[in-house]
C-alpha cells in the first residue's frame, strides 16, 4: 500500500485515506502524453498530451507538462473551483536536438516522438543537446564564460558518471573474475551509456555501477572500434540523470575542461586542465579513423577516467576521455563525433542500414616535426635520428599493423617507394593501396615491413 504523503490538501477531497494499487484502473500499454499520477496521487494514469485540455474533469497533464489557464496562470484548486479549463503546456520551452537528428520545439515534443518511436518498436529518441541540431548558441552569462567553479561542475555531472567493470572467465573453471574497469556517462534517461570501445573490448561481461551504488548488467548496443566509442545499455526502472553533449567545434584553446571518471565504486576521480588544441588531426594521431579529429588537453587522462566525460564549465560533454598516449599529452574524442555516432547508431537500429567499408591498419600516429622529434629525443635517448615522418604512438592489438610487425615508437619514413613526411601521407596511402611496403626507422635501423590494410565497418 502507498501512503498519500506529499499530496496537496485541496486535491484530497474524495480521495481514500490510503492508496490501494489494486483499485487502480488498468492502463493502456502506450500513453500519447506519457504517464502521470491521478488527482489523489494514488494511481498512474495516462496524462493529457501537450495542447490538450486539463483541469476540471479532464485529468492531469502528462510527464513534463503543466496545466496553464489562458492568462498563463498555472492551474490550481482555485482555478478548478472557478470551473475554468486549462491547457497542457511544456514546462521546458527551449528547443532540443534528438538522436534522430531532428530539432524539437521542446523536451515534451521529443518525449512524445520517443514514445511514438518505441510504440513502433524503434529505438527511443534521446536528447543530444540543448538547442537546435545544427546551430551554435553562445551564452555570455554562462558559468564557462564567467567563472572557474570546477567543484560546481563536478557536483552537477557526477550523478551521470558511471563505473564500468569487465569480467573475464578463468580458463578451466570458467568462473568470472573482475579483469578491468573504466568509466562511462549516461546519455538517456532509460539507461544508454557512452564509453570508450576499448573499455568494453573482447566480449567481456560488462557490469555498470551508478553513483548511488546500484549495479546492473549492461548490454553492448553499438561499437565503433576506430573512433573508440561504444554505446551500452542498462535496464533501469525510473529516470536516470543524463549529460548533454556540447559542441566541440565551438571549443577554444585555453578553455577550462574537467575530466571526470569513476574508477572505483561510489567514487569519482577529477582532473582539470585546459584545451591545448581543439581539433588535433586524427590523421596525425593515427588513427583508428583517419578522418577524425581529437581534442588535446593537459587534463590528466588515465585508466581511472578513461571512457568518462570531458566537460566544459557548463557541465556539457565536449569529449570522451581516451587514454593518455604519450607523457604530458592526453586526448579526448570530440562530442561532435559522439553525436554523429549516436545519430548513426539510432539510424542503424531503426533501419538496419548497410555500412560502407573503410580501410584500416590499426595504428595511432602523429606527424613528426623537428620540434616534436627534439622533444621525443629528450624523453627517449634511443629515439631515431629523424625529423619528419609518421611517429607511431600505439599499435592496436589484432590489427594488420601488429601482424605486419609495426611497433610503438617506430617512425614510418616511406611507403611503396614514396617518402612519408606526415601522418596524412600514411592515411592517404592507406585509402589508395591494398599493400603497404613500408620502410620504418626503429632505433637507428631501417626495417622493411609489409602491412595489408583490412576493410572494416566505419
Amino acid at each position: 500500500q502507498l501512503s498519500r504523503a506529499g499530496r496537496s490538501a485541496p486535491l484530497a477531497a474524495g480521495c481514500p485515506d490510503r492508496c490501494e494499487p489494486a483499485r487502480c484502473p488498468p492502463q493502456p500499454e502506450h500513453c500519447e502524453g506519457g504517464r502521470a499520477r491521478d488527482a489523489c496521487g494514488c494511481c498512474e494514469v495516462c496524462g493529457a498530451p501537450e495542447g490538450a485540455a486539463c483541469g476540471l474533469q479532464e485529468g492531469p497533464c502528462g510527464e513534463g507538462l503543466q496545466c496553464v489557464v489562458p492568462f498563463g496562470v498555472p492551474a490550481s484548486a482555485t482555478v478548478r473551483r472557478r470551473a475554468q479549463a486549462g491547457l497542457c503546456v511544456c514546462a521546458s520551452s527551449e528547443p532540443v536536438c534528438g538522436s534522430d537528428a531532428n530539432t524539437y520545439a521542446n523536451l515534451c515534443q521529443l518525449r512524445a516522438a520517443s514514445r511514438r518511436s518505441e510504440r513502433l518498436h524503434r529505438p527511443p529518441v534521446i536528447v543530444l543537446q540543448r538547442g537546435a541540431c545544427g546551430q551554435g548558441q553562445e551564452d555570455p552569462n554562462s558559468l564557462r564564460h564567467k567563472y572557474n567553479f570546477i567543484a560546481d561542475v563536478v557536483e552537477k555531472i557526477a550523478p551521470a558518471v558511471v563505473h564500468i567493470e569487465l569480467f573475464r572467465k578463468l580458463p578451466f573453471s570458467k568462473r568470472e573474475v573482475p579483469v578491468a574497469s573504466g568509466s562511462g556517462f549516461i546519455v538517456s534517461e532509460d539507461g544508454l551509456i557512452v564509453t570508450n570501445a576499448h573499455v568494453v573490448t573482447n566480449k567481456h561481461r560488462v557490469k555498470v555501477e551508478l553513483k548511488n551504488g546500484a549495479t546492473y548488467e549492461a548490454k553492448i548496443k553499438d561499437v565503433d572500434e576506430k573512433a573508440d566509442i561504444a554505446l551500452i545499455k542498462i535496464d533501469h526502472q525510473g529516470k536516470l540523470p543524463v549529460l548533454l553533449l556540447g559542441r566541440s567545434s565551438e571549443l577554444r584553446p585555453g578553455e577550462f575542461v574537467v575530466a571526470i571518471g569513476s574508477p572505483f565504486s561510489l567514487q569519482n576521480t577529477v582532473t582539470t586542465g585546459i584545451v591545448s588544441t581543439t581539433q588535433r588531426g586524427g590523421k596525425e594521431l593515427g588513427l583508428r579513423n583517419s578522418d577524425m579529429d581529437y581534442i588535446q588537453t593537459d587534463a590528466i587522462i588515465n585508466y581511472g577516467n578513461s571512457g568518462g566525460p570531458l566537460v566544459n564549465l557548463d557541465g556539457e560533454v565536449i569529449g570522451i576521455n581516451t587514454l593518455k598516449v604519450t607523457a604530458g599529452i592526453s586526448f579526448a574524442i570530440p562530442s561532435d563525433k559522439i553525436k554523429k555516432f549516436l545519430t548513426e547508431s539510432h539510424d542503424r537500429q531503426a533501419k538496419g542500414k548497410a555500412i560502407t567499408k573503410k580501410k584500416y591498419i590499426g595504428i595511432r600516429m602523429m606527424s613528426l616535426t623537428s620540434s616534436k622529434a627534439k622533444e621525443l629525443k629528450d624523453r627517449h635517448r634511443d629515439f631515431p635520428d629523424v625529423i619528419s615522418g609518421a611517429y607511431i604512438i600505439e599499435v592496436i592489438p589484432d590489427t594488420p599493423a601488429e601482424a605486419g610487425g609495426l611497433k610503438e615508437n617506430d617512425v614510418i619514413i616511406s611507403i611503396n617507394g614514396q617518402s612519408v613526411v606526415s601522418a596524412n601521407d600514411v592515411s592517404d596511402v592507406i585509402k589508395r593501396e591494398s599493400t603497404l611496403n613500408m620502410v620504418v626507422r626503429r632505433g637507428n635501423e631501417d626495417i622493411m615491413i609489409t602491412v595489408i590494410p583490412e576493410e572494416i565497418d566505419p
Epitope: R168, L170, P171, F172, S173, R175, V177, P178, V179, A180, T201, N202, P397, D398, E402, A403, G405
Partner: antibody
Framework: QVQLVQSGAEVKKPGASVKVSCKAS????????MHWVRQAPGQRLEWMGA????????AYNQKFKGRVTITADKSASTAYMELSSLRSEDTAVYYC????????????????WGQGTLVTVSS | DIQMTQSPSSLSASVGDRVTITCSVS?????MYWYQQKPGKAPKLLIY???NLASGVPSRFSGSGSGTDFTFTISSLQPEDIATYYC????????FGQGTKLEIK
C-alpha cells in the same frame, strides 16, 4: 610483487606419492587459476593440471588423470600437487605457475612461476 | 591434441646476430607465447598474444605469425640471451614446443 615459493626437493621410491606445495603472495590468490607444469631432464615442459582456488574446481591432463591431485588452501594462499604411484620417469622438476591473462587479446599464458621442486624417483 | 614442432632444436650464433626460431602447430591457434629458460631456473614469459612484449622484456625480442606458423626473433643477440626458448599454445589445454637451445659461437 607476485611471488610463488615452492617446497624443497624430494627423493621418493617407485610406487610412493609426493606432495609439493606452492605458496602465493603479492596478488589476490582466488582471482587466478594455479597450474602445475613439469620438466623431465632434457624434455619439454608438460602441463599437468590446474585449480581454481576459490571453488576448488580442477582440470587435469589426461596423461596424469587418476595419479595427480591438485588442491588449494585459500586461507594459506597455498596450492598443492600430489602425484601418486611414482615411477622413475616421473623424475622431473615440478613448477607451479600462475595463469596470466591478456586483456587486449583475451589469451591465456603463464606469467609467474615458482622456483621449481626437483622430485627424484629412485629405488 | 595439438602437436607443436619447434625448430631448430639448437643453434649457435654470434653476438649481434639476428636469430630466428619457428614454431608450427598441427591446427590453427589464436595466439602463440614464447618463454626463455636459463639453466636451473624457471621459464620466463617473453612474448604474449603472438607479438606483444611482456613487461620488462628488451625490445630486441619480437614475435610474429598467425594460424599454424609462428616466429620468434632476437634482432641483435646479446651474451645474456643464452638460454633455451620454448613456444606455447593454449587451445583446449596448454602445450609447449620441445625447445630451442641457443648458444654463442
Amino acid at each position: 610483487q607476485v611471488q610463488l615459493v615452492q617446497s624443497g626437493a624430494e627423493v621418493k621410491k617407485p610406487g610412493a606419492s609426493v606432495k609439493v606445495s606452492c605458496k602465493a603472495s603479492g596478488y589476490t590468490f582466488t582471482d587466478y587459476e594455479m597450474h602445475w607444469v613439469r620438466q623431465a631432464p632434457g624434455q619439454r615442459l608438460e602441463w599437468m593440471g590446474a585449480i581454481d582456488p576459490e571453488t576448488g574446481g580442477t582440470a587435469y591432463n589426461q596423461k596424469f588423470k587418476g595419479r595427480v591431485t591438485i588442491t588449494a588452501d585459500k586461507s594459506a594462499s597455498t596450492a598443492y600437487m600430489e602425484l601418486s604411484s611414482l615411477r622413475s620417469e616421473d623424475t622431473a622438476v615440478y613448477y607451479c605457475t600462475r595463469e596470466g591473462y591478456s586483456y587486449e587479446g583475451g589469451g591465456y599464458y603463464f606469467d609467474y612461476w615458482g622456483q621449481g621442486t626437483l622430485v627424484t624417483v629412485s629405488s | 591434441d595439438i602437436q607443436m614442432t619447434q625448430s631448430p632444436s639448437s643453434l649457435s650464433a654470434s653476438v649481434g646476430d639476428r636469430v630466428t626460431i619457428t614454431c608450427s602447430v598441427s591446427s590453427s591457434v589464436s595466439y602463440m607465447y614464447w618463454y626463455q629458460q636459463k639453466p636451473g631456473k624457471a621459464p620466463k614469459l617473453l612474448i604474449y598474444d603472438t607479438s606483444n612484449l611482456a613487461s620488462g622484456v628488451p625490445s630486441r625480442f619480437s614475435g610474429s605469425g598467425s594460424g599454424t606458423d609462428f616466429t620468434f626473433t632476437i634482432s641483435s643477440l646479446q651474451p645474456e640471451d643464452i638460454a633455451t626458448y620454448y613456444c606455447q599454445q593454449w587451445s583446449s589445454y596448454p602445450t609447449f614446443g620441445q625447445g630451442t637451445k641457443l648458444e654463442i659461437k
